[in-house]
């Protein structure tokens, strides 16, 4: 029951996380114009991974896509790649995890197969989450670097008034969505990996059997029918060996490494 709950919760958390990663990737507000120490303007600028936007004070917004591919900064291309890889891995992970869910029965799929699929999807979610966190962090680092560079490039204008040469940009909403979504996907992946341990069948699934000899003390040796007591042949001992070890496991016994010795 706990395994099913852990697996289900892991799936739901990952699903929310991947939806968040997709949302963050599509959002335009990755970087927003820093309004601190900025001349009062009627327009507000913000940029995403795919397009740049200008919003008027009236609320009217105009956006333009980055049509060139070669002219874009390498860092932006890297962030795009990380986010897309995260989405693709997450989507595959979701697909795999649907079939791995314990509450969903598909044909005669064994628990071992479900366990493997759960582990696979869990690893995919972890990598997906890490890709998203890495992508957002690279972009954030780029923003911080540019922010302080533009601050360092300050010049003193006429009358000793200090202003920056370039407009400074700060963290947009998409960065926070991306960080949270990446974290959720990562947590969901860890939960799936934990659930996998509970789903995997045990290596040895035996029930302990104690043998009771009627009469003499019997030493049981797994060597043919020689259940020796120190006196010649003993039919009673043979009988004990043959039929005395009946358990419910005999109805449906699981093969293990001991069966092939």
């Amino acid at each position: 029951m706990a395994v099913t709950a852990c697996q289900g919760l892991g799936f739901v958390v990952s699903l929310i996380g991947i939806a968040g990663i997709i949302a963050a990737t599509c959002m335009d507000q990755w970087s927003t114009q820093d309004l601190y120490n900025n001349p009062v303007t009627a327009v507000f600028n913000y940029q995403g991974l795919w397009r740049s936007c200008v919003r008027e004070s009236s609320g009217f917004t105009e956006c333009r896509g980055y049509f060139t591919l070669l002219g874009l900064p390498a860092m932006l291309q890297a962030v795009r790649a990380l986010m897309i890889v995260g989405i693709v891995l997450g989507a595959i992970g979701l697909l795999v995890s649907i079939f791995a869910l314990k509450c969903i029965r598909i044909g005669s799929m064994e628990d071992s197969a479900k366990a493997n699929m759960t582990l696979t999807s869990g690893i995919m979610f972890i990598v997906s989450g890490l890709c998203a966190i890495a992508g957002v962090s690279v972009f954030a680092n780029m923003l911080v670097t540019n922010f302080w560079m533009s601050t360092a490039n300050m010049y003193t204008g006429m009358g000793g008034m200090v202003q920056t040469v370039q407009t400074r940009y700060t963290f947009g909403a998409a960065l926070f969505v991306g960080w949270v979504a990446g974290g959720l996907t990562l947590i969901g992946g860890v939960m799936m990996c934990i659930a996998c341990r509970g789903l995997a069948p045990e290596e040895t699934n035996y029930k302990a059997v104690s043998y009771h000899a009627s009469g003499h003390s019997v030493a049981y040796k797994p060597g043919g029918f020689k259940a020796s007591t120190g006196f010649g042949s003993n039919t009673k001992n043979k009988k004990i060996y043959d039929g005395g070890a009946r358990t419910e496991d005999e109805v449906q016994s699981y093969p293990s490494k001991h069966d092939y010795v």
Epitope: Q33, N45, F60, T164, T167
Partner: nanobody, 123 residues
């Protein structure tokens, strides 16, 4: 690499009008935000007006609001600055500038610049 060439400057009397033009060599002109800046002798280069990619949003400096109008013709790869009710303090070298992603009032945000055209206002 966008090359910008300004024209239309000259001598005009106070209260007069002038229309400046800025022609761009690049066929991808519509993917640039365009701006007009001016620099009077001994002063900083200052923002005059700016216009977004398709012309949907325009921004003006407070000193020119209501007197100057910025417009663009993407088919002709040209941006215009219509200047009315000119004052002596409007006299300066007017520069056309292009920038791909942001409409701002800071000169450092603009990557491409023209050579400038002189506007003189006599009283």
């Amino acid at each position: 690499q966008v090359q910008l060439v300004e024209s239309g400057g000259g001598l005009v009397q106070t209260g007069g009008s002038l229309r400046l033009s800025c022609a761009a060599s690049d066929s991808t002109f519509s993917s640039y935000i365009m701006g007009w800046f001016r620099q009077a002798p001994g002063k900083e280069r200052e923002f005059v007006a700016g216009i977004t990619w398709s012309g949907g949003i325009k921004d003006y400096a407070d000193s020119v609001k209501g007197r100057f109008t910025i417009a663009r013709d993407n088919a002709k790869n040209t941006v215009y600055l219509q200047m009315n009710s000119l004052k002596p303090e409007d006299a300066a070298i007017y520069y056309c500038a292009a920038n791909a992603i942001q409409l701002t009032r800071r000169s450092g945000d603009y990557a491409y610049w023209g050579q400038g055209t002189q506007v003189t206002v006599s009283s």
